[in-house]
Interface confidence: medium
């Protein structure tokens, strides 16, 4: 237990969020970070994973309603599996119906997140900014 | 000290953010909430104050870089003082130079925040969504 050495007292009227990597956004106990540098999907995934996170996974409009207001397009962890035609997240879980509106912007097997819960299909090799996410336990 | 009754252990590799009102966004120990309902500036200010917060104050591009990616227009706490022509925050502090690009969209004495650190002048009576902010100590 040696890693745990700070004690924090929390007022009942408010609450702490996290824990998250330093200077990440914390919302409803999930951690998010928006990265400015443009990378292809694979390098974006590698960047997130090197920070003990994954590319954005959209699992709930309620718990992730902050995503409504995100400007521009950013890689998320959604990929097309050609063999069965489904869209799946990096961890292998299936995209739940009615969570995202999938729009075919380009031919491709990766998807960009855009505001108001839209997913734009894009070629995985195209450089884009990206969103990393870490779910707290 | 009766309000403080939760103890949290924090891993050194990560950190907690806050405290913030429940389900607010926490970033670099500031708390933010985006409100969907459209209100005029005065009602928006009252709404934030009733939650022990104020309308958004932009004080640092570095500490508030999450605001770069905010879509749409939202009331912030910036108001025009006709007597001296300056733009001030609710707390009376002057708008720092080079923080916001002020754009005259309408005749008015209030300002809407828009992505990439822009401020749009608007009539204070016009209904808009708004951003509340609470700075943690």
């Amino acid at each position: 237990n040696s890693l745990f050495n700070q004690e924090v007292q929390i007022p009942l009227t408010e609450s702490y969020c996290g824990p998250c990597p330093k200077n990440w956004i914390c919302y409803k106990n999930n951690c998010y970070q928006f990265f400015d540098e443009s990378k292809n999907w694979y390098e974006s995934q590698a960047s997130c994973m090197s920070q003990n996170a994954s590319l954005l996974k959209v699992y709930s409009k309620e718990d992730q309603d902050l995503l409504k207001l995100v400007k521009s397009y950013h890689w998320m962890g959604l990929v097309h599996i050609p063999t069965n035609g489904s869209w799946q997240w990096e961890d292998g879980s299936i995209l739940s119906p009615n969570l995202l509106t999938i729009i075919e912007m380009q031919k491709g097997d990766c998807a960009l997140y855009a505001s108001s819960f839209k997913g734009y299909i894009e070629n995985c090799s195209t450089p884009n900014t990206y969103i990393c996410m870490q779910r707290t336990v | 000290n009766s309000l403080f009754n939760q103890e949290v252990q924090i891993p050194l590799t990560e950190s907690y953010c806050g405290p913030c009102p429940k389900n607010w966004i926490c970033y670099k120990n500031n708390c933010y909430q985006f409100f969907d309902e459209s209100k005029n500036w005065y009602e928006s200010q009252a709404s934030c104050m009733s939650q022990n917060a104020s309308l958004l104050k932009v004080y640092s591009k570095e500490d508030q870089d999450l605001l770069k990616l905010v879509k749409s227009y939202h009331w912030m706490g910036l108001v025009h003082i006709p007597t001296n022509g300056s733009w001030q925050w609710e707390d009376g502090s002057i708008l720092s130079p080079n923080l916001l690009t002020i754009i005259e969209m309408q005749k008015g004495d209030c300002a809407l925040y828009a992505s990439s650190f822009k401020g749009y002048i608007e009539n204070c009576s016009t209904p808009n969504t708004y951003i509340c902010m609470q700075r943690t100590v």
Epitope: Y42, E43, A46, S47, M49, Q88, D91, G92, S93, C110 | -
Partner: antibody, heavy 121, light 107 residues
Framework: QQLEQSGGGLVTPGGSLKVCCKA?????????MTWVRQAPEKGLEWIGC?????????YYANWVNGRFTLSRDIDQSTGCLQLNSLTAADTAMYYC??????????????WGQGTMVTVSS | DIQMTQSPSSLSASVGDRVTITCQAS??????LNWYQQKPGKAPKLLIY???TLQSGVPSRFSGSGSGTDFTLTISSLQPEDFATYYC?????????FGGGTKVEIK
């Protein structure tokens, strides 16, 4: 598409060894190369993975504790696992593996043939 | 770390039998679970990913089910080539972990 492993063999306790895995038939730079080991008559144990692209990002199991190091050579489409401070408990078959799709990192459909590492005095 | 508990550790069955192997995760992993088959002296072979999706080229007698923490691999009619050891593996997050394995032997 295949993964061809090399290296391995007999090493004394405290010694070091390098095991490598050459990829062919696919774009190495878009995949994660993963390493898994299996002690004699035991189950599979994940060691870690390295991204084949420019970032060369790595991820390790907690138990590795700095003793093992992953590296990769983009020009050679090769990933290597450097094993240091070896003990008898590290005696195992070491496998490299590749995910089923470039977009995955944790589901493996292509495996190397395995390389046996024996630690004994 | 997520622990994966597989049962039974071994079982004896005859050709034509229906065989069921279970795997339990120590926390909710949605459907992020894979099943592998391994024969002596060979590398593992992916059978099923995402809990229930059959890998290309794998016979349809293999099926997977489950979500959350409880998962099942079923072989509807055991064939001679199916005698092997089967492993589950979660793909939810790092570090990855495998179940202890289930050895399917001839009765």
């Amino acid at each position: 598409q295949q993964l061809e492993q090399s290296g391995g063999g007999l090493v004394t306790p405290g010694g070091s060894l390098k095991v490598c895995c050459k990829a062919s038939g696919f774009d190495f730079t878009t995949y994660w190369m993963t390493w898994v080991r299996q002690a004699p008559e035991k189950g599979l144990e994940w060691i870690g993975c390295i991204h084949g692209g420019d970032s060369g990002a790595t991820y390790y199991a907690n138990w590795v504790n700095g003793r093992f190091t992953l590296s990769r050579d983009i020009d050679q489409s090769t990933g290597c696992l450097q094993l240091n401070s070896l003990t008898a408990a590290d005696t195992a078959m070491y496998y490299c593996a590749r995910p089923g799709y470039p977009s995955w990192s944790k589901t493996f459909d292509l495996w190397g043939q395995g390389t046996m590492v024996t630690v004994s005095s | 770390d997520i622990q994966m508990t597989q049962s039974p550790s071994s079982l004896s069955a005859s050709v034509g039998d229906r065989v069921t192997i279970t795997c339990q995760a120590s926390q909710d992993i949605s459907n992020a679970l894979n099943w592998y088959q391994q024969k002596p002296g060979k590398a593992p072979k992916l059978l099923i990913y995402a809990a229930s999706t059959l890998q290309s080229g794998v016979p349809s007698r293999f099926s997977g089910s489950g979500s959350g923490t409880d998962f099942t691999l079923t072989i509807s009619s055991l064939q001679p080539e199916d005698f092997a050891t089967y492993y589950c593996q979660h793909s939810n997050s790092f570090p990855l972990t495998f179940g202890g394995g289930t050895k399917v032997e001839i009765k």
